[in-house]
Each structure stands twice: as structure tokens, then as C-alpha cells.
Amino acid sequence: TQHGIRLPLRSGLGGAPLGLRLPRETDEEPEEPGRRGSFVEMVDNLRGKSGQGYYVEMTVGSPPQTLNILVDTGSSNFAVGAAPHPFLHRYYQRQLSSTYRDLRKGVYVPYTQGKWEGELGTDLVSIPHGPNVTVRANIAAITESDKFFINGSNWEGILGLAYAEIARPDDSLEPFFDSLVKQTHVPNLFSLQLCGAGFPLNQSEVLASVGGSMIIGGIDHSLYTGSLWYTPIRREWYYEVIIVRVEINGQDLKMDCKEYNYDKSIVDSGTTNLRLPKKVFEAAVKSIKAASSTEKFPDGFWLGEQLVCWQAGTTPWNIFPVISLYLMGEVTNQSFRITILPQQYLRPVEDVATSQDDCYKFAISQSSTGTVMGAVIMEGFYVVFDRARKRIGFAVSACHVHDEFRTAAVEGPFVTLDMEDCGYNIPQTDESTLMTGRA
């Protein structure tokens, strides 16, 4: 999981200040015992900061040591700081845990920029604002790192929620969620509601605010409106999905749909941006520029570098288009679309202009490793990682930031033929050449 550009976006307040909360709609789906309903103890259990990640509180060891852990659906290791580091307020002290077991094995994880390395072991782990269970899980005790921890981010470790296939050092290291499901009665499913604030938060605001919810083992109706639409998980490694069509303000990009998934498309809470393959990114930016041509922005803005600032409260959301991604549906020849607003893909940035201005970064960027549906996408939606049924669900998030004219949307069904052809088949490569970091 890559840093800088790969760490999640921002937290927000559950009530989506400066935006509007959508009214609750009645629920049409039948109850599935143990999987749906109310998970009050888990609602609002995430916090975070713009561009620096959403984190959950976890306890490790006996007696329990409390740590804040980044929630990352784009990796599969549970790894925590285990040695002093200038950016860590606290770290896991294995010598103080009576239940720690050393696996006598090292792990080294390089990223495109930066790396971490550590020692593998197991210990007892629980999530205070999660299911009332304790599990013995694999833990990578990070002893050395470079450009991994972020100054002021307030998290001390990472919870990789993807599948064993991409675990380091190899797929024999059971990920935390697999251990949780095996050792308890928690259903094999979790869901995420990441709440972007729509404006930058300072450190004290972050600590006092809600960043969203991670519901472990179920779906909470209060976190979304309308219906949940599901797309198949194509392969259990990353949370890989298939995009079959892309529209900018309703205008089809008209590309071979394989391009959208070259070389894969994944849902990744550990990435800030919506990242698109080079050809797709170029076509999308061209289309977004054309749609917003009443104003011209510098080249560096479209590269995600320069920030554009407007007088506070006057951001011209209306000149920016909505972006729709059509995802393969569960039924043959059926797709559905998720639509995000500029309120999701223009990321508020703090501390750069005066307090009288609102400044934003363009949070869509180029990728050489496929499409990454990062926090920019996820902040619009309640996302259900239904591992048991090998599918990912999307519904409009009850906390997404919008205005009085447009809201994020999840709509369907649409007839789409030959969707299987949209998937790219990655040539079989030796495991060691798999790149962890995404450039």
C-alpha cells in the first residue's frame, strides 16, 4: 500500500457540515440475521485527517495496549509501529505483553516511495468499538520504516483488510479479518462509511470529530440511503472489480472498457485519490476541462499539485461535472452506476491560503497499475465488503458532502453486454515481482 498519494483522504463530521444530509428512505431488502440491522457500538468508530487516513482504535496484547490503526482495504498485513519513531506518540511494546508470541520471521515491505520492515509475531487483538471479541492475530512489529508513518496523522499502524494472496511475506500469513472470522462467529463481511468533511480540519478538530464507520460483521441501515447495489469481486487478492463504462456529466468516454481495468480495478480505502490508467486519466481530464471551461486552471492543478482557491463559500461546484463509473452487476448483462460529485474529487486542503479562502487539490490522478477507487470514491458511498458472497455493495452514503442541486448516486439496472471482456487478464508473474506500491 503506497504512501503519500496512497494514504487515505480525510475524515469528516457525521452530519456533513457545509453539505446536506440525505433523508432516509425505507429499506426494501429482507433482513439476514447477524448481517443487517443496527450496529450502534460501531457507528462513528473511525477518525482521521485530510489526506492522512481513516483509523480505528484497536488494542493489542495483554494487558491491552491501545493504538490507532489505519483502515486499508488495499493491503493484507496487520502491521504496527513497535519501536520509537519521531512521528509516533506511542507504539506496540511486545516485551510488555504476556500473550505475545514471536514467529521468528522477518517481513520487508517496499513501496514505490518508502518502506517498512519488521518482525512477525502473534498476539491478542480486539477492537473496542467493534465486535465484542478477542482474536489471536498475526502482527508485523514495525522496527524500521521510511516515509511510512505520517507526522500528525495520529495513527500508529495499518490494518490490511484485503486477502491473503497479497499478504507479505507470502500468502501463508493469515490476514487479520480471516483470523477474526475463523475464531469467532463474526460474519465474513465488513462495511465502510468514510465521511469527507468537505472542508479541511485542523488537528484538534480531527480528534474531536467523526470520520465515519467501520461495521464489522454487518450492514447498518442508518449509514446509507436508497438501495445497495452489488458488483462481483473478480478475484480475491485486492478487492478487484470490473468497470464497464465511464461517463463525465453523462457523456460516455467511449473507450474500450478493458482500458478502464488495465491492469485491474480495485476498491482501496488506503488511497486518497481516484486513480485511473494513463489513457483513461487523459481522456477524463480532457472531458472535465471541457465541462468546466468557463474557468481555466493551471496544468499543475490537473496534475494534483497546484491548489485552486476560491473565496470561502463560493466554490463554483456547478462548473465541475459529475463522474459516473458503471460497475458489472450481479446479473448477466446488467450493470449499475455510481456517480460522484466535485465535492468528492476536489479535496479540501488546509493551511495554504488565508482563512478567507477555500483551497482544493484535484484528487483524480494517473496510475500505472490500474484503477484505484480510493477515498475520493468511497466518501460518496457506504461500501459493503461482502466477502462471504464475493461481492462489493455500494449505496449512497448518509454523510456524503453535496449541495442543493446534485447528490452522489447509485443507480441501476442498465443493460451492458459482454462485460466479462472488460476484465484484463494479468500475465502470470513470479510472486516476487508483484509491486506493492502503486505509482
Partner: antibody, heavy 120, light 108 residues
């Protein structure tokens, strides 16, 4: 060769409105490649950005002057203008118009500037 | 707000000497920094943009370097016409708005 020329009264009374026009020759204010801006420099002091405008009329202003500034563009006349209301002696400065080029990030061509004195 | 601090305020040198001017940003501006030259009674002139690119018609003795928060304008060998005030300007935040306070290069 593109040139910019500021014009307007050199003396304005306190509380009145300062009005300046920048005429662009050898180029066009309707170009999609540039913004057009105003910068001022009080005597013996540094440069202060006032605001910028695009051909569509989209404007950006310095927050410290925003309540008093209006910038407009007339592409048919190849001109853009500055109005600064409720002036005081602190607004006495050389006022420059400039083209914002190089990826619309820098002031790559400037007018010669015009001194505006606020005095009764 | 990003603040640009230029140093020294005044640099006293002789023709033929090397001039090194500094511009420090209060936070990273990546490479979005320009240098301008202003002679008495004249408008500023763009010298360097994007930290190190010379603008059209600018002599090779002018060079810019740096990224992030620390930037340098170097004049390799001062010519008589180079004695002027030099300003830096950042455009990480757009539209371009923030200038440094200036460095005066005067004849020793």
C-alpha cells in the same frame, strides 16, 4: 509583440473609486491560454496582487481587498479594467496590469505601470 | 497562508561577482516559484519560472534552483544592468498571489 498599457486618472480623492483600464495590443484578452491581472506597489514597498480575470469574466481577488475590488474584461475592446472603491492614502501606489502566462501561474508580461495618488 | 521570506534584504556586490539570493517558503510550494527583476522606475520582469526555468530572453547568467521550501536565484557574474530589486513569487496556491518582500542588489 504583445504590449499592455495602463490608463486612468493619476489622482483620486479619498473615499472615491479608483478606475484603471489596461489595453492589450498585439494579443487578445479572449485567448484561452491566459488570465489577466492587476498588481500594485506602494512607493518604496513590495508587490501586492490585487486580482485576476479570465476571458469568461471569471474573477479572483486578493482576500484583503476583495470587498472593494471589481475587475472586468471587455474582449471586444481588448481591455480589462480595475475599480477600487472607498480609497484611502494607503491605496497610493503604482498600479500594474499583467498577463498571467506560463501555465497561467506567473506574470510573464507587464505594463509600464501608472502611479495613482490618493489625496484630497 | 504561505509566506515567502527573502534574504538578505540588501546585497552589496561588485560587477563580475556572483550573487546568491534566497527565498524561503513557510511551507512547501513544490517547484511553483518564480523570480522577477525590477529596475528603478520600471515594471518587474519575469526571470525564472517553475523554480529553474529561464523565461524567454533571459541571459544564461541567471539561474534558479531549489524545491519545497528553499529556493535560490544565482547570478553567476553580475553585469552593471543586474543591479536591481529581485522578488520571488509562489503559485502553489492559485491564482498566483504571494510575493516575497524583495532583495535589493546594489553596487558595493
Amino acid at each position: 509583440q504583445l504590449q499592455l498599457q495602463e490608463s486612468g486618472p493619476g489622482l483620486v480623492k479619498p473615499s472615491e473609486t479608483l478606475s484603471l483600464t489596461c489595453t492589450v495590443s498585439g494579443g487578445s484578452t479572449s485567448s484561452s491560454s491566459y488570465y489577466w491581472g492587476w498588481i500594485r506597489q506602494p512607493p518604496g514597498k513590495g508587490l501586492e496582487w490585487i486580482g485576476s480575470i479570465y476571458r469568461s469574466g471569471s474573477t479572483y481577488y486578493n482576500p484583503s481587498l476583495r470587498s472593494r475590488v471589481t475587475i472586468s474584461v471587455d474582449t471586444s475592446k481588448n481591455q480589462f479594467s480595475l475599480k477600487l472603491s472607498s480609497v484611502t492614502a494607503a491605496d497610493t501606489a503604482v498600479y500594474y496590469c499583467a498577463r498571467v502566462g506560463h501555465g497561467i501561474s506567473y506574470f510573464d508580461l507587464w505594463g509600464r505601470g501608472t502611479l495613482v495618488t490618493v489625496s484630497s | 497562508e504561505i509566506v515567502l521570506t527573502q534574504s538578505p534584504a540588501t546585497l552589496s556586490l561588485s560587477p563580475g561577482e556572483r550573487a546568491t539570493l534566497s527565498c524561503r517558503a513557510s511551507q512547501s510550494v513544490s517547484s511553483y516559484l518564480a523570480w522577477y527583476q525590477q529596475k528603478p522606475g520600471q515594471a518587474p520582469r519575469l526571470l525564472i519560472y517553475d523554480a529553474s526555468n529561464r523565461a524567454t530572453g533571459i541571459p544564461a547568467r541567471f539561474s534558479g534552483s531549489g524545491s519545497g521550501t528553499d529556493f535560490t536565484l544565482t547570478i553567476s557574474s553580475l553585469e552593471p544592468e543586474d543591479f536591481a530589486v529581485y522578488y520571488c513569487q509562489q503559485s502553489l496556491t492559485w491564482p498566483p498571489r504571494t510575493f516575497g518582500g524583495g532583495t535589493k542588489v546594489e553596487i558595493k
